[in-house]
């Protein structure tokens, strides 16, 4: 008899386009021996999995390299990683734990993922003033990016005599070395996220002091 | 009662067949995958062949690839193990064994002895 | 195929002794190890299941532990009736190969 077991938490859960989400799974603490196998991870009405442990199982090429099913079995973690969240990615996805060689597996109840538009914009940081012919490092920031994802593509865009600086997965310094004219004109930080195609920007005006 | 009771062991001559068969009780058998192992006298355990529980699917050890045949009659609760071109070295103990990935029920054994 | 070794390959102990058997894997099998204890002349029983499940039945004294390529088996406590050859066997790809086996004897 196939076996069921309910996901815990929420029915839903919602992710923003190019964002990273976690969905929660445990395995039922009493597993006989004979139904332990693979963790499949499935779409709702799919036969291919979205993601497995199965070395032998190939999985839908639309979520290959960004669902990820995280398996241990000690802390009876079957949880599902999704990165870079597309829209198409809005469904119900299921569970699975099944051997080949047996008939049955146990299987989890549904949860809904939705995907929504990105709304985050990134934030730019000024430290103090910008003195005309001063140096200044800016820092655009997208801290509700997670750290698996795809790294975002950082660009800026300025009138201004500028270099780039260091570069996170969360964020870009722009050295910036404004001059008198460059007062009242546009920076602009814009962040693409390649693993979902989405972009988001920022744009402030500069506020230049003369020296 | 979980049981598995394996039959058909004996001395065979090198190059001749043999069929061992597994009779199982106290379980769905066509749910099970089922699984042969065996052991040389004074040595470890050797993983021989598995089987789906609905015999569509098989792998083998290749000591053993192309010599033996594991299948399964659903409608008797019966595992067999044909056994061709034996060899010396096919001298063991064969045990019929329940589980997908993991055994969990073994039989006692049936002894064969490849010998001229 | 992967090759699963088992350390040591016997080993004396005493009633009450803590004994660890370890069985590394040649690649990665991720959580898919079973422990098995055969007794001369009978045939094989689990202990564990899932690198660290206990199977129903075993004495807690049992336990298991380990990922990817390196296990271990525990006994805490050596009662006389664990004095037998255990077994890891590698349930991630066929063939389900089986360690050499660990040969536990009475001090």
């Known amino acids: 008899q196939e076996r069921r077991f309910q996901l815990e938490g929420p029915e839903s859960l919602t992710v923003q386009e190019g964002l990273c989400v976690l969905v929660p799974c445990r395995l039922p603490t009493t597993l006989p021996a004979s139904y332990y196998g693979y963790g499949y991870w499935f779409l709702e009405g799919a036969d291919v999995p979205v993601a497995t442990n199965d070395p032998d199982e190939e999985v839908q090429e639309e979520t290959r390299g960004r669902f990820h099913l995280l398996w241990d079995p000690r802390r009876k973690n079957c949880s599902l990683s999704i990165r870079d969240a597309r829209r198409r990615d809005n469904a119900a996805y299921f569970f699975r734990l099944k051997s080949k060689w047996m008939k049955y597996g146990y299987t989890s109840s549904k949860l809904s993922v939705r995907v929504m538009a990105l709304t985050h914009r990134p934030n730019i940081s000024i430290p103090g003033t910008l003195e005309s012919g001063h140096p200044s490092n800016l820092t655009c920031s997208v801290p509700w990016v997670c750290e698996q994802g795809t790294p975002p593509i950082f660009s800026w865009m300025s009138a201004a005599p500028t270099s780039l600086g260091p570069r996170t997965t969360q964020s870009s310094v722009l050295t910036i070395t404004p001059r008198p004219q460059d007062h009242s004109t546009n920076l602009t930080c814009q962040v693409t996220f390649p693993g979902a195609g989405v972009t988001m920007e920022r744009t402030i005006q500069l506020n230049v002091s003369y020296a | 009662e979980v049981q598995l009771l394996e039959s058909g062991g004996g001395v065979v001559q090198p190059g001749r067949s043999l069929r061992l068969s597994c009779a199982a009780s106290g379980f769905t058998f066509s749910s099970y995958g089922m699984h042969w192992v065996r052991q040389a006298p004074g040595k470890g355990l050797e993983w021989v062949a598995v089987?789906?529980?609905?015999?569509?699917?098989?792998h083998y050890a290749d000591s053993v690839k192309g010599r033996f045949t594991i299948s399964r009659d659903n409608s008797k609760n019966t595992l067999y193990l044909q056994m061709n071109s034996l060899r010396a070295e096919d001298t063991a103990v064969y045990y019929c064994a329940r589980g997908g990935q993991t055994i969990d029920i073994w039989g006692q054994g049936t002894m064969v002895t490849v010998s001229s | 195929d992967i090759v699963m070794t088992q350390s040591p390959s016997s080993l004396s102990a005493s009633v009450g002794d803590r004994v660890t058997i370890t069985c590394r894997a040649s690649?990665?099998?991720?959580?898919?190890l079973n422990w098995y204890q055969q007794k001369p002349g009978k045939a094989p029983k689990l202990l564990i299941y899932a690198a660290s499940s206990l199977q129903s039945g075993v004495p807690s004294r049992f336990s298991g532990s380990g990922s990817g390529t390196d296990f271990t088996l525990t006994i805490s406590s050596l009662q006389p009736e664990d004095f037998a050859t255990y077994y890891c066997q590698q349930s991630y790809s066929t063939p389900y190969t089986f360690g050499q086996g660990t040969k536990l004897e009475i001090k």
């Open positions: 690649q990665s099998i991720s959580s898919y």
């Open positions: 089987i789906s529980y609905d015999g569509s699917n098989k």
